[in-house]
């Protein structure tokens, strides 16, 4: 008789989750020589230990501390790029601008990017059927707590000028409920960070509006200013040209506004 299993509202653990995490770890440590000392089996064990046999609505940041410790790495604190609702362009940018880093360019972010996972209380099984949804079920689920933990630490590490890429095509360009709006913004340290510079990415071909004047950007400016951090904002009218100019800054067309 099959054992009763809790039905959650969200999708289940990504198929082949253990193999994916392990393979990503191996790949990452091969690509990044400074991380070659990392034992990927230990990383997987620590990752697994954070959520296996635990109630998937009762996960804490402490559960992830062994993994955080194993994933310790160096990221220049003045080369951090945060993003909200525009992950692909942010990642394309750091692939070209190799000295800048998003959270997913770090080992821990790379391991978990786009994956879902959860376990079950008192069994060593991974739940591939369903996992808790942040809204419908609970916020202290394995995935949400992981991203909250690593995002907080990433923001706490930032210094000097921090950049954030925002999606100008969305109704809320700055969303207080996003990871950036709810976690990262509030963990930038005023003693370390001088300025937050927002890059608002335009979607439409002929969109020449100044999206830095958008009410949600003004709300972000207010939040940042209240943290005693300076705020600046730039429109990126043509993201395709923006990326091209990052690749080839000497191009004559790159002197004009992008």
């Amino acid at each position: 008789v099959p054992r009763w299993r809790q039905q959650w509202s969200g999708p289940g653990t990504t198929k082949r989750f253990p193999e994916t995490v392990l393979a990503r770890c191996v790949k990452y440590t091969e690509i990044h020589p400074e991380m070659r000392h990392v034992d990927c089996q230990s990383v997987w064990d620590a990752f697994k230990g954070a959520f296996i046999s635990k109630h998937p609505c009762n996960i804490t940041e402490e559960d992830y501390q062994p993994l955080m410790k194993l994933g310790t790495q160096t990221v220049p604190c003045n080369k951090i790029l945060l993003w909200s609702r525009i992950k692909d362009l942010a990642h394309q940018f750091t692939q070209v601008q190799r000295d800048m880093f998003t959270l997913e360019d770090t080992l821990l972010g790379y391991l978990a990017d786009d994956l879902t996972w959860c376990g079950e209380f008192n069994t060593s099984k991974i739940n591939y059927q369903s996992c808790p949804d942040w809204r419908k079920d609970c916020s202290n689920n394995p995935v949400s707590v992981f991203w909250k933990t690593v995002s907080r630490r990433f923001a706490e590490a930032a210094c000097d000028v921090v950049h954030v890429m925002l999606n100008g095509s969305r109704s809320k360009i700055f969303d207080k409920n996003s990871t950036f709006g709810s976690v990262e913004v509030h963990n930038l340290q005023p003693e370390k960070v001088q300025t937050l510079e927002a890059w608002v990415i335009h979607g439409g071909r002929e969109d020449s509006r100044d999206l830095c004047q958008d009410p949600t950007i003004k709300e972000l400016e207010s939040i940042i200013s209240k943290r005693n951090i300076q705020f600046s904002c730039k429109n990126i009218y043509r993201p395709d040209k923006f990326l091209q100019c990052v690749k080839n800054p000497e191009d004559s067309s790159c002197t004009s506004e992008i």
Epitope: T74, V75, P76, R153, A157, P190, E191, Q194, R227, N228
Partner: antibody, heavy 114, light 111 residues
């Protein structure tokens, strides 16, 4: 150029109150937090806390909760440190230092003596 | 609170020689490999002057005779070669975690 100019020395009796000022110039005052640091005669530096110059919200180190108060006069680009119910052990030079601790005031000597 | 322990409390160095000051933190002052540790020089009657930030970065206008090294919990300020003008007390400070604590100071004298 950026400057922090503090008020002059103070001689006070135990139990009295002192208020020292730190006037900033050369930058937008509300853009950078202001730290306060204590240095007793012949002793080391002790961070007292900081004040958010945009909101006026103070943060105090544990040893400076109670009798110590940070405040602002934004229109005058000035930060203030007030110490009430002065004790002999408050005798020290008090420094203001802008966010980053690159720019410091010249210091204000407060002497508490009966 | 993070405790910063400086050693030695005082040292005497001949002109032109190397001075080395140590600062040890009770817990790591680093995050993502960035050590948020500063070094200051203070002369009598003056406010402290920032020499080094983030453990090894030389503040603008500071002579290259001053250098900082270390990470995590163990840090060193080196002055090489020492000049007469370097007579002062040197302090380390961490800003990784509130409260932003200072070390006890190291007094540098000329032999």
């Amino acid at each position: 150029q950026i400057q922090l100019v503090q008020s002059g020395p103070e001689l006070k009796k135990p139990g009295e109150t002192v208020k020292i000022s730190c006037k900033a110039s050369g930058y937008t005052f509300t853009n950078s937090g202001m730290n306060w640091v204590k240095q007793a005669p012949g002793k080391g530096l002790k961070w007292m806390g900081w004040i958010n110059t945009y909101t006026g919200e103070p943060t105090y180190a544990d040893d400076f909760k109670g009798r110590f108060a940070f405040s602002l006069e934004t229109s005058a680009s000035s930060a203030y440190l007030q110490i009430s119910n002065l004790k002999n052990e408050d005798t020290a030079t008090y420094f203001c230092a802008r966010r980053g601790f690159v720019y410091w005031g010249q210091g204000t000597l407060v002497t508490v003596s009966a | 609170d993070i405790v910063l322990t400086q050693s030695p409390a005082s040292l005497a160095v001949s002109l032109g020689q190397r001075a080395t000051i140590s600062c040890r933190a009770s817990e790591s002052v680093a995050i993502y490999g960035n050590s948020f540790l500063k070094w200051f020089q203070q002369k009598p009657g003056q406010p402290p002057k920032l020499l080094i930030y983030r453990a090894s970065n030389l503040e603008s206008g500071i002579p290259a005779r001053f250098s900082g090294s270390g990470s995590g919990t163990d840090f060193t300020l080196t002055i090489n070669p020492v000049e007469a003008d370097d007579v002062a007390t040197y302090y380390c400070q961490q800003i990784n975690e509130d409260p932003y604590t200072f070390g006890g100071g190291t007094k540098l004298e000329i032999k």
